[in-house]
Amino acid sequence: LQDLCSNCPAGTFCDNNRSQICSPCPPNSFSSAGGQRTCDICRQCKGVFKTRKECSSTSNAECDCISGYHCLGAECSMCEQDCKQGQELTKKGCKDCCFGTFNDQKRGICRPWTNCSLDGKSVLVNGTKERDVVCGPSPADLSPGASSATPPAPAREPGHSPQ
């Protein structure tokens, strides 16, 4: 026997214990699929959450985080405090990245600078708390006679002016 409740559209509920006809979801509740036996209570975006999309009778509310926080988890189930670039969030709050690590975002952890020598490259720009190092050509690429489509800029020692 076909379940007549399956004919009930989103935005309604159906109770098999009575005449099988669909009833509208009460205010602040929703059913996002047809054939539902109950309507779910709308999510409320309170505290560190703010409403990105209002609830309707057929879809739940969607939340974002207020300024100074960012979403974590599926459907922004949690809000985590932002830190500045060059910092990471610890149990004691935002802490500067240790030497040799960086974080270029307001979230996440400090990551180690790239080790240019592992790729046989040299450090072109030093790393900071906010930025990774920039790796340049390998030392071999800078030796005289090395073929290169664009010759490297002439190396200069500090304190020496070009001739």
Epitope: N7, C8, P9, A10, G11, T12, R18, S19, I21, C22, S23, P24, C25, P26, P27, N28, E54, S56, S57, T58, S59
Partner: antibody, heavy 114, light 107 residues
Framework: EVQLVESGGGLVQPGGSLRLSCAAS????????MHWVRQAPGKGLEWVSY????????YYADSVKGRFTISRDNAKNSLYLQMNSLRAEDTAVYYC???????WGQGTLVTVSS | EIVLTQSPATLSLSPGERATLSCKAS??????VSWYQQKPGQAPRLLIY???NRYTGVPARFSGSGSGTDFTLTISSLEPEDFAVYYC?????????FGGGTKVEIK
């Protein structure tokens, strides 16, 4: 701000027809079912019809079944009520309301009289 | 069809007094009852849904209770703007139905 604005009411003779419209704004119209509810002068509220968000499910009060047709155009954020074979007892202010029955329009008066 | 019977038809009270309005359903409607306020020339305004939940922006002096067949709207201390007609409505089963209304008037 949620707004529902009805239009299309007026004076019509018995047996005549009218088409009411309800313009919705301030919410995602396509995600809500909609109702028509009416109120005869000096009387209580009477539910008339319901249409689901996508238009697939429709219900009518027995008093209007076969004479009234509810429809919607989600692209235009509009709800409609086509009223045929009008009778004196259909005289009322007609309100549109979201399926949560939380927001109502200001109503449009339909008078059926010869 | 579920019939909702409201009583009394008229309630004559003074500002500051407590108002108790009754709504009885002809059969079990669970908690799917709402209360509306209507003033002359205006559309109904939702006050209470799900028998006891105050809708957004509704003052705390309005409260609802009950389930099954017996429901009550209470206004703890009447303000001048509360004098109006109050309707109960059920959304448990189609056709949706409303009570005949209770008029709360100034004594």
């Amino acid at each position: 701000e949620v707004q529902l604005v009805e239009s299309g009411g007026g004076l019509v003779q018995p047996g005549g027809s009218l088409r009411l419209s309800c313009a919705a704004s301030g919410f995602t119209f396509s995600e809500f079912g909609m109702h028509w509810v009416r109120q005869a002068p000096g009387k209580g509220l009477e539910w008339v019809s319901y249409i689901s968000s996508g238009g697939s499910t429709i219900y009518y009060a027995d008093s209007v079944k076969g004479r009234f047709t509810i429809s919607r155009d989600n692209a235009k954020n509009s709800l409609y009520l086509q009223m045929n074979s009008l009778r004196a007892e259909d005289t009322a202010v007609y309100y549109c309301a979201r399926d949560w029955v939380d927001y109502w329009g200001q109503g449009t008066l339909v008078t059926v009289s010869s | 069809e579920i019939v909702l019977t409201q009583s009394p038809a008229t309630l004559s009270l003074s500002p500051g007094e407590r108002a108790t309005l009754s709504c009885k359903a002809s059969e079990n409607v669970g908690s799917y009852v709402s209360w509306y306020q209507q003033k002359p020339g205006q559309a109904p305004r939702l006050l209470i849904y799900g028998a006891s939940n105050r809708y957004t922006g509704v003052p705390a002096r309005f409260s609802g209770s009950g389930s099954g067949t017996d429901f009550t709207l209470t206004i703890s201390s009447l303000e001048p703007e509360d004098f109006a007609v109050y309707y109960c409505g059920q959304s448990y089963s189609y056709p949706l139905t409303f009570g005949g209304g209770t008029k709360v008037e100034i004594k």
